[in-house]
Amino acid sequence: LPEMAQPVDPAHNVSRLHRLPRDCQELFQVGERQSGLFEIQPQGSPPFLVNCKMTSDGGWTVIQRRHDGSVDFNRPWEAYKAGFGDPHGEFWLGLEKVHSITGDRNSRLAVQLRDWDGNAELLQFSVHLGGEDTAYSLQLTAPVAGQLGATTVPPSGLSVPFSTWDQDHDLRRDKNCAKSLSGGWWFGTCSHSNLNGQYFRSIPQQRQKLKKGIFWKTWRGRYYPLQATTMLIQPMAAEAAS
């Protein structure tokens, strides 16, 4: 049986954990309220370092962060599987690590977007992430919270595999989205979103170049390269995917 957090003082509901936490949410549950770097060890996985964001909604694991273009995100499948970048700066945690955190549970995925005028948007989805045998398919398991869901992600129930330039799993037969755009992503038809695209500090004149950028179509449009993005995940307690 999995080791549970031991109550230290039931009157104050303080818990203690005698192993590395499984994820950021478990850290939150034992009283950790400070965001930052922690080593975690999901069931059956070696330990690894994560950024935890502690909020009123609990502990979230940061799985992606972009804000200055310091890290090249145009990488092959193995890099997206393992993870890359700097935990203090820009990074992609790694699909295998994310899957080890979520397991077979449904999860909340939060997406924070920022444009160059200081405007910000927060989106939340209920999702299920498959393992490598599904090409880490992302499935929407509930309607999207907020205004921007409709054309951003696949309809509820549809699974979209992850794609890179060297592993084309997108839903376009005539095109390799990762090759014609940039970076690895859950590409459906290439045009809805790509938060792992090329980072532009200034807007290029040529649309052909512009389409390779970081975008979220239903927020600032297909050809607006965003200034910053953060993706966070939080598994839902004891809730397996149907």
Epitope: V30, Q34, G36, F38, E39, L49
Partner: nanobody, 126 residues
Framework: EVQLVESGGGLVQPGGSLRLSCAAS???????????MGWFRQAPGKEREFVAA????????PYADSVKGRFAISRDNAKNTVALQMNSLKPEDTAVYYC????????????????WGQGTQVTVSS
């Protein structure tokens, strides 16, 4: 100057107990409660290995499988100290024990520790 100073090591018989203590001092440790702390050990001819760690608030205390149920780590943030209570000691626990401090919230991996003490020798023998 940053300093971690271990004490409490010595010679003990199998089945016996020892309590190691580590005192942190220096400008860096004026905010001791912003560091997680850990104990590591190194036996002759072997690599340094993780023993136990404690988070900033003391609520997360991972242990190496080999010491689980026998060792207990604790900290006193008011006194800038961390202790390792070692019970039911075995000959294989013989090693130099090191105290270390990390800016990571909790960690069991050596490379995440920034500051190290000089170590204290623990010998378990009859």
């Amino acid at each position: 100057e940053v300093q971690l100073v271990e004490s409490g090591g010595g010679l003990v018989q199998p089945g016996g107990s020892l309590r190691l203590s580590c005192a942190a001092s220096g400008r860096t440790f004026s905010t001791f409660n912003t560091y997680s702390m850990g104990w590591f050990r190194q036996a002759p001819g072997k690599e340094r290995e993780f023993v136990a760690a404690i988070s900033r608030g003391g609520n997360v205390t991972p242990y190496a499988d080999s010491v689980k149920g026998r060792f207990a780590i604790s900290r006193d943030n008011a006194k800038n100290t961390v202790a390792l209570q070692m019970n039911s000691l075995k000959p294989e626990d013989t090693a130099v024990y090191y105290c270390a401090a990390s800016k990571i919230g909790i960690a069991s991996t050596i490379r995440y520790y920034d500051y190290w003490g000089q170590g204290t020798q623990v010998t378990v023998s009859s």
